[in-house]
């Protein structure tokens, strides 16, 4: 094949090599960019900056090599459009630093930075940690800081991410209240901070106030939906990012719902209870306290992480006619109480007939299959009941 006269020449099926001295000063308009998986750049003294726009359209890029060039600065978001990048070689350039944000979100198997005049500072604490933890092939490079010795020996006692303290009201919060949260940020070299409120949706009206080092957040006219929702304060400095999440407990009275008994490996009377704080529960059977046992007991389903409502069953493992009757669930918390009742019929009473009456003879085909002598339990018939929601 004839030698390629261009600044950048194809290499394999999806690679590009740019090695002609001084031919590039940016990576705009590379030929076939959208399909490139490998880009090799060498001897480009004029290529000094790598920014977000440079790698736009290189979504398939896996391997990027820029070596023996003039690279001085890589923007923190430079690789935003190359999420598949797994090998990054920036050796023998003019890099003094590289932000932790640059590699955040990438799954780099290899990061090569040897031969750069790195300047030891807290901004390289993340790289020092990679070296300590054996990540990305960094330890083998024995990275040096220009005129300061090995990166591994850089003092790091003062290199911490921001410290966050979120103040939440310690008094009870009721539906309709306004709540003020304050996030206090401490640390060196603070760059950015803010709130993450993605979980809040319609739980409150949100107003942000203030800035570093003290961020305010007012949640106005809160609803009970605010419970179990994370409100997150975040802050960043040159070392990294810190986040602290808090939840605001909004008090509201107990409520309860009961549903018709269903057979689920024995029987279940399904219920839902809600309230903040979580209500205490008590069952009544025909008006009397039902003492729970290993054969009649309350069983909760796994709770959803972001809601207060709890679903469960009153489990009746072997109910017979003696368990037929009226079941009431009482739920109470300091803000109110609620109850719901349901009639449940699990099995007909085999002894329920008048001795004076002729003994009924059933010709129902259901009975012909019953050979064990057990009472016939018609499992296809739904027990009658009513569903009541209170609260």
């Amino acid at each position: 094949a004839a030698p390629c006269p261009d600044a950048c020449c194809p290499h394999g099926s999806s690679g590009l090599r740019c090695t002609r001295d001084g031919a590039l000063d940016s990576l705009h308009h590379l030929p076939g960019a959208e399909n490139l998986t490998e880009l090799y750049i060498e001897n480009q003294q004029h290529l000094q900056h790598l920014e977000l726009r440079d790698l736009r359209g290189l979504g398939e890029l896996r391997n990027l090599t820029i070596v023996k060039s003039g690279l001085r600065f890589v923007a923190p978001d430079a690789f935003h459009f190359t999420p598949r990048l797994s090998r990054l070689n920036l050796s023998f350039n003019a890099l003094e630093s590289l932000s932790w944000k640059t590699v955040q979100g990438l799954s780099l198997q290899e990061l090569v930075l040897s031969g750069n005049p790195l300047h030891c500072s807290c901004a390289l604490r993340w790289l020092q940690r990679w070296e300590e933890e054996g990540l990305g092939g960094v330890p083998e490079q024995k990275l040096q800081c220009h005129g300061q010795g090995p990166l591994a020996h850089m003092p790091n006692a003062s290199c911490g991410v921001p410290t966050l303290k979120v103040q939440v009201p310690n008094a009870s919060v009721d539906v309709g209240d306004d709540v003020l949260l304050r996030c206090q940020v401490e640390g060196r070299g603070l760059e950015q901070a803010g709130w993450i409120l993605t979980e809040l949706e319609q739980s409150a009206t949100v107003m942000k106030s203030g800035g570093l080092p003290s961020l305010g957040l007012t949640l106005a006219n809160v609803t009970s939906d605010l419970n179990r929702k994370n409100v997150t304060c975040w802050a960043e400095n040159d070392v990294g990012r810190a986040e602290v999440s808090v939840q605001v407990n909004v008090s509201f009275p107990a409520s309860v719902q009961l549903h018709t008994a269903v057979e689920m490996h024995h029987w279940c009377i399904p219920f839902s209870v809600d309230g903040q704080p979580a209500p205490s529960l008590r069952w009544l059977f025909n008006g009397s306290v039902l003492n729970e046992t290993s054969f009649i007991f309350t069983e909760f389903l796994e709770p959803a992480a972001n809601e207060t409502v709890r679903h469960g069953c009153l489990r009746l493992n072997q109910p017979t006619h003696v368990n037929n009757g009226n079941y009431t669930l009482l739920a109470a918390n300091p803000f109110g109480q609620a109850s719901a009742s349901i009639m449940a019929a699990f099995m007909d009473n085999p002894f329920e007939f008048n001795p004076e009456d002729p003994i009924p003879v059933s010709f129902s085909p259901v009975d012909t299959n019953s050979t064990s002598g057990d009472p016939v339990e018609k499992k296809d018939e739904t027990p009658f009941g009513v569903s009541v929601a209170v609260g």
Partner: antibody, heavy 117, light 106 residues
Framework: QVQLVQSGAEVKKPGSSVKVSCKSS????????MHWVRQAPGQGLEWIGE????????NYNEKFKNRATLTVDISTSTAYMELSSLRSEDTAVYYC??????????WGQGTTVTVSS | DVQLTQSPSSLSASVGDRVTITCSAS?????MHWYQQKPGKAPKRWIY???KLASGVPSRFSGSGSGTDYTLTISSLQPEDFATYFC?????????FGQGTRLEIK
């Protein structure tokens, strides 16, 4: 697989107490009731009580109500049965057994408690 | 308390025999459960909910009954079936067991 592993044999003096442990593995400890059953030499099975780790609910056989104490440690998935004021007739093998929707599905290997002066 | 009375207390039988053990409750129980125990071992759940065989229990075993009277039947006795069998009620506190039926080789 489900395992209930009980503590080793004990020899106790009359009037003293014994605490038998039952360590669970292979299932979600809090979802199952734990029963305690004893069997005197050459005799039948006698139910002592049951406990639900999920909420600490305990039911005792009236016969043991004042002497038996059932507890659980959820952090270690372990159930305990303590029997106080021991007498010679408490000499028996003590078993733990778990149940959820069906009775006593799995049993521990048993712990022999001998009460002798 | 619900008293459970098993009969017979002990039974000598030969391999291949059909054997029936009964359990009578002092008051009605919804279901009966049966356990097998061999010397020096913990009991094993054998039949539950009156007629369901526990995992690994051979089909020669069966259970039946209702109200106060329940039976465990072995259709054709095998050498490994010689053991003690206990019935148990799980319908009221305290849970109670029958006194046991010892099945031995004739």
């Amino acid at each position: 697989q489900v395992q209930l592993v009980q503590s080793g044999a004990e020899v106790k003096k009359p009037g003293s107490s014994v605490k038998v442990s039952c360590k669970s593995s292979g299932y979600t400890f809090t979802n199952y009731w734990m029963h305690w059953v004893r069997q005197a030499p050459g005799q039948g099975l006698e139910w002592i009580g049951e406990i639900y780790p999920n909420n600490g609910r305990v039911n005792y056989n009236e016969k043991f109500k004042n002497r038996a104490t059932l507890t659980v440690d959820i952090s270690t998935s372990t159930a305990y049965m303590e029997l106080s004021s021991l007498r010679s007739e408490d000499t028996a093998v003590y078993y733990c057994a778990r149940s959820r929707y069906d009775p006593m599905e799995d049993w521990g290997q048993g712990t022999t408690v001998t009460v002798s002066s | 308390d619900v008293q459970l009375t098993q009969s017979p207390s002990s039974l000598s039988a030969s391999v291949g025999d059909r054997v029936t053990i009964t359990c009578s409750a002092s008051s009605s129980v919804g279901y009966m459960h049966w356990y097998q125990q061999k010397p020096g071992k913990a009991p094993k759940r054998w039949i539950y909910d009156t007629s369901k065989l526990a995992s690994g229990v051979p089909s020669r075993f069966s259970g039946s009954g209702s109200g106060t009277d329940y039976t465990l039947t072995i259709s054709s006795l095998q050498p490994e079936d010689f053991a003690t069998y206990f019935c148990q009620q799980w319908s009221s506190i305290p849970l109670t067991f029958g006194q046991g039926t010892r099945l031995e080789i004739k």
